[in-house]
């Protein structure tokens, strides 16, 4: 018996071939011997089966001795043995229809779980293997689960159902809702304008929800809400903003916040959360601000940084085009009685200068 695998919702074509290459009488029946369709001369006739409105054949092939049964919009319950009667012969084809669906919405938040459920006909024992867009393979039986979805899991999942050494392939598009970056850090000199950007890693037609930025300043004992906002069809509207600092927010995506001035009291870490309509859970992005200040008070030239810096970062004070006068893996360095000229305060790591501030020291008369 020939086995054919089909996909729920798809169209399948079961073949039946006569030895004579001409149009002769044929009938397709199901396992209950109920006629599905056949021919009377050059006319297609249909029987009283449940497939009535979904069954068809290809009249253009009859003259070649081919009498296919086409079933549209396949259902799991269409799984059956189909019999083609032609030239006193019976050709049997076993059709097995499978369906694969995501348990919930195919738009899932980062960190959530994806469950894929296989619908299969009674008596079948299929195995399923799915491959994620980043090449991760998962296998199982009737259900497959992936916990802790990552951004790289966004895209087309390809699932192969195996039964009777035949296979059928399903493609499911999964969108992982997340920010492009889990964390970012901004380095600024005191007084400079600060731009925070929170680009999303997905695009959807309509995006509605609400968000908030909580900020933990290095100098503060507790965190506070800096801004709350609403998102309606990708349009941003501010609900509430603190007086200090007075953040500004862009009206369109990507989410964009502007801090008019980088000041030591603002240095620290923030957490932007975004709750999307009809979704449980929230999207998160951490943002960090490091602020540098170079000052001269009487005979003391000082450079300081505030904010979440790596302990490996080096803070240096140097006269332009000269060797560093002082370099320390600390958050403050100073030079007593600095000579006149343009001094540079540098914050660097193993690969680059991250932040630089210049200060002019005038000659003392």
């Amino acid at each position: 018996k020939k086995v054919v695998l089909g996909k729920k919702g798809d169209t399948v074509e079961l073949t039946c071939t006569a030895s004579q290459k001409k149009s002769i009488q044929f009938h397709w029946k199901n396992s209950n011997q109920i006629k599905i369709l056949g021919n009377q001369g050059s006319f297609l006739t249909k029987g009283p089966s449940k497939l009535n409105d979904r069954a068809d054949s290809r009249r253009s092939l009859w003259d070649q001795g081919n009498f296919p049964l086409i079933i549209k919009n396949l259902k799991i319950e269409d799984s059956d043995t189909y019999i083609c009667e032609v030239e006193d012969q019976k050709e049997e084809v076993q059709l097995l229809v499978f369906g694969l669906t995501a348990n919930s919405d195919t738009h899932l938040l980062q960190g959530q779980s994806l469950t894929l459920t296989l619908e299969s006909p009674p008596g079948s024992s299929p195995s399923v293997q799915c491959r994620s867009p980043r090449g991760k393979n998962i296998q199982g039986g009737k259900t497959l689960s992936v916990s802790q979805l990552e951004l790289q899991d966004s895209g087309t999942w390809t699932c192969t159902v195996l039964q009777n050494q035949k296979k059928v392939e399903f493609k499911i598009d999964i969108v992982v809702l997340a920010f492009q970056k889990a964390s970012s850090i901004v380095y600024k000199k005191e007084g400079e304008q600060v731009e925070f950007s929170f680009p999303l890693a997905f695009t959807v037609e309509k995006l509605t929800g609400s968000g908030e930025l909580w900020w933990q300043a290095e100098r503060a004992s507790s965190s506070k809400s800096w801004i709350t906002f609403d998102l309606k069809n990708k349009e941003v509207s501010v609900k509430r903003v603190t007086q200090d600092p007075k953040l500004q927010m862009g009206k369109k995506l990507p989410l964009h916040l502007t801090l008019p001035q980088a000041l030591p009291q603002y240095a620290g870490s923030g957490n932007l959360t975004l709750a999307l309509e009809a979704k449980t859970g929230k999207l998160h992005q951490e943002v960090n601000l490091v602020v540098m200040r170079a000052t001269q008070l009487q005979k003391n030239l000082t450079c300081e940084v505030w904010g979440p810096t790596s302990p490996k970062l080096m803070l240096s004070l140097k006269l332009e085009n000269k060797e560093a006068k002082v370099s320390k893996r600390e958050k403050a360095v100073w030079v007593l009685n600095p000579e006149a000229g343009m001094w540079q305060c540098l914050l660097s790591d193993s690969g680059q200068v991250l932040l630089e501030s210049n200060i002019k020291v005038l000659p003392t008369w």
């Epitope: 080096m314 660097s348 790591d349 991250l354």
Partner: antibody
């Protein structure tokens, strides 16, 4: 393509000196911190030293401090390790590796050489 | 110097198994931790950086987690090519320090 090739290894007597070199190609050498890492026979990996992109900052493992000196020549795209007062326990395969620094926040060693073998024996 | 304690020191497993290796820092290192794979006669290979970020080109069966002092490397389904020695490295502060290593062998 990005490549690191170590050289200069060999057999040396205890108390003597040796200089290892690491030739870099396929990337902007002067924009990366560079490390030496070693593996003694039958032992695990041990970090040895780092030199920053401009050569101004160097840090060492306690086990080599005062005996080894890391240096670089950015014009020649080459990293060095000067090893003085060598001991039997310095016998190892020495790897050079580059450090990627992202935003002063994330660090990792993504490209490694194949290593050069140093044997300290009398 | 920050000490890194890695466990277990050796591990026997079969192809398809899920394996977990842990690393503990003697003090908080935020997410300043990487995982490296070493095979005999080969150069070490970066798998995970910043505790949980998968290096480009590394199979997604590898994942890292943790922050502060406790970290984990998980291989969700062992492949024949995964049998090797694994090391954690703290790159939070100088001097950098490796864990003692975990030798993963075929059962």
């Amino acid at each position: 393509q990005v490549q690191l090739v170590e050289s200069g290894g060999g057999v040396v007597q205890p108390g003597r000196s040796l200089r290892l070199s690491c030739a870099a190609s396929g990337f902007t050498f002067s924009s990366y911190g560079m490390h030496w890492v070693r593996q003694a026979p039958g032992k695990g990996l041990e970090w040895v030293a780092i030199i920053w992109y401009d050569g101004n900052n160097k840090y060492y493992a306690d086990s080599v401090k005062g005996r080894f000196t890391i240096s670089r020549d950015n014009s020649k795209n080459t990293l060095y390790l000067q090893m003085n007062s060598l001991r039997a326990e310095d016998t190892a395969v020495y790897y050079c590796t580059r450090e990627v620094a992202l935003e002063g926040y994330y660090y990792y060693m993504d490209v490694w050489g194949k290593g050069t073998t140093v044997t300290v024996s009398s | 110097a920050i000490q890194m304690t890695q466990s277990p020191s050796s591990l026997s497993a079969s192809v398809g198994d899920r394996v977990t290796i842990t690393c503990r820092a003697s003090q908080g290192i935020r997410n300043g931790l990487g995982w490296y794979q070493l095979k005999p006669g080969k150069a070490p290979k970066l798998l995970i950086y910043a505790a949980s970020s998968l290096q480009s080109g590394v199979p997604s069966s590898f994942s890292g987690s943790g922050s502060g002092t406790d970290f984990t490397l998980t291989i969700s389904s062992l492949q024949p090519e995964d049998f090797a020695t694994y090391y954690c490295l703290q790159d939070y502060n100088y001097p950098y320090t490796f864990g003692q290593g975990t030798k993963l062998e075929i059962k």
